[in-house]
Interface confidence: medium
Amino acid sequence: MGVFNYETETTSVIPAARLFKAFILDGDNLFPKVAPQAISSVENIEGNGGPGTIKKISFPEGLPFKYVKDRVDEVDHTNFKYNYSVIEGGPIGDTLEKISNEIKIVATPDGGSILKISNKYHTKGDHEVKAEQVKASKEMGETLLRAVESYLLAHSDAYN
């Protein structure tokens, strides 16, 4: 088994606490609302949102994958950290066992925030990770972030 690690950083004009509340804690409700072209629904399969919770994320017709199942690994409300793993569906299968993701939202002096994202692809055997898969995952994350960010900018009363 191999582990391939990809790390990215992206910035947001939204303060860290507000972004964590909307993007992380209420993403299940917000993503289908603000980015229906990317995510059609998020369904809690088991758990209450804390570690061990399993969520099924369904994608609209026309996207490469029908769904993925995510497992929540850690939610740190104090340090704005969220760890989860993609454990079923989507790219998970013969060559890929799981994807472990870590997101940390850090406040910046200008009142915005930086999202530090780590994606660890756990492959089976000697398989490698396809560059297209990493790119698609990054683009999905960016789409969701910008959608949430724009929603928050337009609705100043939300998630304060």
């Epitope: 603000v34 724009s150 337009a154 609705h155």
Partner: antibody, heavy 119, light 111 residues
Framework: EVQLVQSGAEVKKPGESLRISCQGS????????IAWVRQLPGKGLESMGI????????RYSPSFQGQVTISADTSTRTAYLQWNSLKASDTGIYYC????????????WGQGTRVTVSS | SYELTQPPSVSGSPGQSVTISCTGT?????????VSWYQQHPGKAPRLMIY???KRPSGVSHRFSGSKSGNTASLTISGLQAEDEADYYC???????????FGGGTKLTVL
């Protein structure tokens, strides 16, 4: 094909109430914001407000807050725009339209409902 | 009420190009890649022509293109045809104002 079909033209008197409708088809109705857009005779487009049918989250543009009520029924895939007391100045064409993207664009548009308010 | 600024009218001869501008602020046009353009023929519903500044929906002619510089977005129609005669509206996502803003509209006349 994604489509929005609106109810027919209405002629009303000032002070009367009215509800016009917009039925969506060809897509997951509960997952997309619907906007209502007003066009007064010979004038431009004004966004009145938007609703997310999935949870009825509704946002009104300031000049329409308290003047109209926007609602939706996911079981019939229908959005509504309602007035409790019409004024002559409400005369115009009202379009329902699905919001796409972030949501940041309007597509497709309903055919429009002409509302005439006259004594 | 606040709206994006468009010229009331523009005109051009068949085959020519015309450009319609749409000026806002850094809170709307300049702040996002989220300007869209709509064509409206008399007595008809508007139709989406450009979204997210430069993208063209399927079915819209390549003669229509969008661009943006700073707080001003532009719609350019090349190779003007008689059927392009219509009203054109820009729209931008916005912050801190009514969150959905249309321009006042521009009447395009094909001479």
């Amino acid at each position: 094909e994604v489509q929005l079909v609106q109810s027919g033209a209405e002629v009303k008197k000032p002070g009367e109430s009215l509800r016009i409708s917009c039925q969506g088809s060809g897509y997951r109705f509960s997952n997309y914001w619907i906007a209502w857009v007003r066009q007064l005779p010979g004038k431009g487009l004004e966004s009145m407000g938007i609703i997310y049918p999935g949870d009825s989250d509704t946002r009104y543009s300031p000049s329409f807050q308290g003047q109209v009520t926007i609602s939706a029924d996911t079981s019939t895939r229908t959005a509504y725009l309602q007035w409790n007391s019409l004024k002559a100045s409400d005369t115009g064409i009202y379009y329902c339209v699905r919001l796409g993207g972030i949501p940041d664009w309007f597509d497709p548009w309903g055919q429009g409902t002409r509302v005439t308010v006259s004594s | 009420s606040y709206e994006l600024t468009q010229p009331p009218s523009v005109s051009g001869s068949p085959g020519q190009s015309v450009t319609i501008s749409c000026t806002g602020t850094s809170s709307d046009v300049g702040g996002y890649n989220l300007v869209s353009w709509y064509q409206q023929h008399p007595g008809k519903a508007p139709r989406l022509m450009i979204y997210e500044d430069t993208k063209r929906p399927s079915g819209v002619s390549h003669r229509f293109s969008g661009s943006k510089s700073g707080n001003t977005a532009s719609l350019t129609i090349s190779g003007l045809q008689a059927e392009d005669e219509a009203d054109y509206y820009c729209y931008s996502y916005a912050t801190g104002r009514p969150s959905r803003l249309f321009g006042g509209g521009t009447k395009l006349t094909v001479l």
